[in-house]
């Protein structure tokens, strides 16, 4: 199961952690892929490291953990993330946060 | 640019165990972060992945034949090897190599980029 | 698993016209789709990955599209030398597996 806090929100300008978290007796990650909607943020391979999409590059940082921080926010980021799991033996899992970028104080 | 050669007996007996090596040139074994992988062609047939094992160690296999199949790597001699236990005539294929996510961390992608020529094995008494 | 399956198993087209190959998977694999052109006595060589992308060194006239569990390789002017198998696979869920394959051949 994928265990989340589906609604989080941070100050633009500020930065804020992505984080979702998988557990299971019988399968273990092999993989972990973020996107914002439909757009790649990045991928954590287990084998492989980290790929950021370039278009994140300056603004997404990998960690901690299988997480992201997400930093210099904008209003335009304010929407759903999705993290998908890959595991072994096979199985996909997926977990949503909504992220609600405010005007910063 | 990494470079992979199989090797191993074109001929094995059924009930016995198949055993290939691939050799990688052109870079350390231990130094690169991929999977290493074992695909086979039956004659006239499509591809089946058999299965690879990671840079951490893991293993993965194809479910049809996990309980007959062992990957490993021996990083002195820049070598992974496949064992398949128990051949029968039906696993007699090409046997390739070959490597996945060589450009996974610019990119993005896990694909089979890299491919040793492959070596014919039969199963025959 | 999940199953890929290519459509049609032989395509009969002339040196310079289009070819257009179909790959289906039987559950959402987003864009990670591989294809692959294999001709005899050969191995497999990357063409595309990530549904879209042209492999190193592959000419223009390769093109793929398509997300989710429907994809199409389109080779756009047909050459002498794109007369081979074509194989689709899925990566990265467990296990790694590739349609049976389209043979394009000379009409």
């Known amino acids: 199961t994928i265990d989340t806090k589906r609604n989080i929100s941070a100050e633009e300008g500020g930065s804020v952690i992505l984080q979702c978290h998988f557990s299971s007796d019988t399968a273990e990650v092999t993989q972990v892929d973020w996107k914002q909607q439909d757009q790649l943020l990045a991928i954590y391979s287990v084998d492989l490291g980290w790929h950021v999409a370039s278009v994140f590059s300056d603004r997404v940082v990998p960690g901690p953990s299988l997480g992201l921080t997400f930093q210099s926010l904008t209003m335009n980021d304010t929407g759903e993330y999705f993290c998908t799991y890959h595991t072994y033996p096979g199985g996909i899992y997926k977990g949503r946060i909504f992220l609600k970028v405010q005007e910063s104080s | 640019q990494l470079q992979l050669q199989e090797s191993g007996p074109g001929l094995v007996k059924p009930s016995e165990t198949l055993s290939l090596t691939c050799t990688v040139s052109?870079?350390?074994?231990?130094?690169?972060?991929?999977?290493w992988a074992w695909i086979r062609q039956p004659p006239g047939k499509g591809l089946e992945w058999i299965g690879s094992i990671g840079t951490s160690g893991s293993t993965y296999y194809n479910p049809s034949l996990k309980s007959r199949v062992t990957i490993s790597v021996d990083t002195s001699k820049n070598q992974f090897s496949l064992k398949l236990s128990s051949v029968t005539a039906t696993d007699t294929a090409v046997y390739y190599c070959?490597?996945?996510?060589?450009?996974?961390?610019?990119?993005?992608?896990?694909?089979?980029?890299?491919w040793g020529q492959g070596t014919m094995v039969t199963v025959s008494s | 698993e999940i199953v890929m399956t290519q459509s049609p198993a032989t395509l009969s087209v002339s040196p310079g016209e289009r070819a257009t190959l179909s790959c289906r998977a039987s559950q959402s694999v987003s864009s990670n789709l591989a294809w692959y052109q294999q001709k005899p006595g050969q191995a497999p060589r990357l063409l595309i990955y990530?549904?879209?992308t042209r492999a190193t060194g592959i000419p223009a006239r390769f093109s793929g599209s398509g997300s989710g569990t429907e994809f199409t390789l389109t080779i756009s002017s047909l050459q002498s030398e794109d007369f081979a198998v074509y194989y689709c696979?899925?990566?990265?869920?467990?296990?790694?597996?590739f349609g049976g394959g389209t043979k394009v051949e000379i009409k």
């Open positions: 696979q899925q990566s990265p869920p467990w296990p790694r597996t």
């Open positions: 052109g870079g350390s074994i231990s130094s690169s972060r991929y999977y």
């Open positions: 070959a490597i996945e996510g060589a450009n996974f961390r610019d990119f993005g992608y896990v694909a089979f980029d890299i």
């Open positions: 990530g549904a879209s």
